[in-house]
Interface confidence: low
Amino acid sequence: AIVFIKQPSSQDALQGRRALLRCEVEAPGPVHVYWLLDGAPVQDTERRFAQGSSLSFAAVDRLQDSGTFQCVARDDVTGEEARSANASFNIKWIEAGPVVLKHPASEAEIQPQTQVTLRCHIDGHPRPTYQWFRDGTPLSDGQSNHTVSSKERNLTLRPAGPEHSGLYSCCAHSAFGQACSSQNFTLSIADESFARVVLAPQDVVVARYEEAMFHCQFSAQPPPSLQWLFEDETPITNRSRPPHLRRATVFANGSLLLTQVRPRNAGIYRCIGQGQRGPPIILEATLHLAEIEDMPLFEPRVFTAGSEERVTCLPPKGLPEPSVWWEHAGVRLPTHGRVYQKGHELVLANIAESDAGVYTCHAANLAGQRRQDVNITVATVPSWLKKPQDSQLEEGKPGYLDCLTQATPKPTVVWYRNQMLISEDSRFEVFKNGTLRINSVEVYDGTWYRCMSSTPAGSIEAQARVQVLEKLKFTPPPQPQQCMEFDKEATVPCSATGREKPTIKWERADGSSLPEWVTDNAGTLHFARVTRDDAGNYTCIASNGPQGQIRAHVQLTVAVFITFKVEPERTTVYQGHTALLQCEAQGDPKPLIQWKGKDRILDPTKLGPRMHIFQNGSLVIHDVAPEDSGRYTCIAGNSCNIKHTEAPLYVVDKPVPEESEGPGSPPPYKMIQT
């Protein structure tokens, strides 16, 4: 048999809180347990679900959980079924609602001296206790002119008068908690003695020294009083005006007139209406002084013909908002067409050259008018006045290539040489009119040149080929003074170029013919074996038909090249002793000898008392010091050639003789001893 060990029991529960209906069974075989609510099976949800054989509630719901719950145990094998005792919840709850008009049927029917009933739609279990409020102040039962029916949840006002006007709200509390009305009710019962607005003053914007009018009217029985105040609560009447409102007039109908308005009159004006009963009604209006700021200067604009462009006129700040319009040549622009105004923009569609000129943006309001000009230039594509021509330019002379164009604005001209931009330097100069000047034409200037003339509207270009007319010249010019080594073979070259290949020949300056051992081979003078007589002046002559001839004079010297008879040797000297570095050279012309020590030439006139250079070329250094150590170079030179040889000088301390060494022991290295 199935036995219930624990049965569900009825219990109190709180709306939205947890709860548990317990059920435990014992049976000989397996049973399954399910729950019934008012006889219907309970389906599991996230809120309400079986927990073992008990039924768990995550949040009790007064609507879904009202009724009788029963736990059922069933043995599916035997078909035996057992049901628990019934259990239900006593759910405690409270729920907010609005304050509504119960009587009369509509707000339109509310009149002074009628009964008005309001209902508080807050409900709950157990039944809550109600509290009413007017404008946030609690109303207690039994107060004059109203009754509160807690059972009916009603507030009755009998008779209702203007003093009952206000915002009605209610709150209710019970064992479960508290709630206040979700929507309140405004009761408005007119009182003829209260001031009511007939005409409210409006904000006014006026120009300086103009007049301003504020209208203000109230009605009541008996008629209300009216008072004007300015900013700092200063009253304005026809009898007592504040110093800064001397030109203020208050009319019988309540209107306020201000004449010759000045900046100090701007501000907030308050119109106050006071009935025999009820609160004062305060209406505000502001007097603004019209103003308009200056407009800053426009940047000039450059446009291209055929394009569409817009120029925006940023309106100046002003009160009231300034109106903006564009003019050209004194005529206001239309709102459509080819050149027109759109909003604050000047629009130029399919721009023509004739559109160039000054356009004016105007802005105006009560405070005045502002204007600003914009200068519009219509750029045109350059046209040719003179294109660059294929040209023959003479080498060594200035050359010119024209590139003359016209356009608006003035075109910019750039030149290219072999597709490379020419930057102005000492050789190239571009004149203001576009002409290119090559200051000194060189052979390699013979190539293609291209000029490009541009404006924002576009560019044109043309090219020309330059042919350089080469001048007759030596390439390179022969050295005017040359040396040949005696008894050796020698050559003296001479070459030249010109528009036609020149003929080159050598002759002696005195006109005498060349000896038979000297040959002139295509401009190269060849000496098979140089003799003393070969020295002298020679002339190289280059000539061609169109350019005539040029001459180069060469003085040839015959020399015996320098050799060293004596060369300086590696030398080590004791400190304080004398060093001798020998050097002798021979050659013709007789060579002169110079010494270089420590990377500087030793000037014989500035050697000082310790150093001396002998006539044969040897160098003597007395009283040597460690700083004299280093490499010394003997340089021999004459008008034909120069040779040098070098040797190191070491300066060392004199060793102190040891006892083991005999007095005749030699030093450990080669020495000069003095």
């Epitope: 426009f298 940047e299 000039p300 100046p316 000054v358 003035k410 910019t412 404006t455």
Partner: antibody, heavy 120, light 113 residues
């Protein structure tokens, strides 16, 4: 790099006309986009703007000098000029030419200035 | 005309210290529609023309050291040299370019203390 160079006589006699020229180099004077100004500085004093010209010839002169002043332009020579009539000792000053950028009228390039003395 | 008033007339500041120059315009030079202040600052050394250092009240001209800065709006502006160097000794001028005639301040001479 645009450069400006003022030129003109350093000494002018009273009641005569002061004439100065400003040569613009290193840039295209007539490509638009700049106003070309004259400014002067009396000895030991501050700067006084005289007027400007656009390459197309549009001018604006400071009101105090308007009756005596003419600013003109020669686009072919990349030059603009200042003429000031009926000079007095009060016109003795260093005169500068300058470039004002794109209608925003701050002077971003100045000439070195030339001293003009009005004396008999 | 818009009158530009600079203060002080002269200013002596130690090397490495901050120098501050004020400039007041008689009219607003802030244009509300683009929120730009039409004001520039120039530096003039003896025997030289003025050199533009700040425009739009706070934008540094290229090549001007970042120790120079401009601030302010409407009618009140300031030029600040945060750490004065010997080469900053000069007269400084403000200039409005809101409307013609263009007008300059009277100048402020900055010296080393």
């Amino acid at each position: 790099q645009v450069q400006l160079q003022e030129s003109g006589p350093g000494l002018v006699k009273p009641s005569q006309t002061l004439s100065l020229t400003c040569t613009v180099s290193g840039g295209s004077f007539s490509s638009g986009g700049y106003y070309w100004s004259w400014i002067r500085q009396h000895p030991g004093k501050g700067l006084e703007w005289i007027g400007y010209i656009y390459y197309s010839g549009t001018t604006y002169y400071t009101p105090s000098l308007k009756s005596r002043i003419t600013i003109s332009v020669d686009t072919s020579e990349n030059q603009f000029s200042l003429k000031l009539n009926s000079v007095t000792a009060a016109d003795t000053a260093v005169y500068y030419c300058a470039r004002a950028g794109f209608g925003y009228y701050y002077m971003d390039v100045w000439g070195k200035g030339t001293t003009v003395t009005v004396s008999s | 005309d818009i009158v530009m008033t600079q203060s002080p007339d002269s200013l002596a500041v130690s090397l490495g210290e901050r120098a501050t120059i004020d400039c007041k315009s008689s009219q607003n030079v802030l244009y509300s529609s683009n929120n730009k202040n039409y004001l520039a600052w120039y530096q003039q050394k003896p025997g030289q023309p003025p050199k533009l250092i700040i425009y739009w009240a706070s934008t540094r001209e290229s090549g001007v050291p970042d120790r120079f800065s401009g601030s302010g709006s409407g009618t009140d502006f300031t030029l600040t040299i945060t750490s004065l160097q010997a080469e900053d000794v000069a007269i400084y001028y403000c200039q409005q370019y809101y409307s013609t005639p263009l007008t300059f301040g009277g100048g402020t001479k900055v010296e080393i203390k």
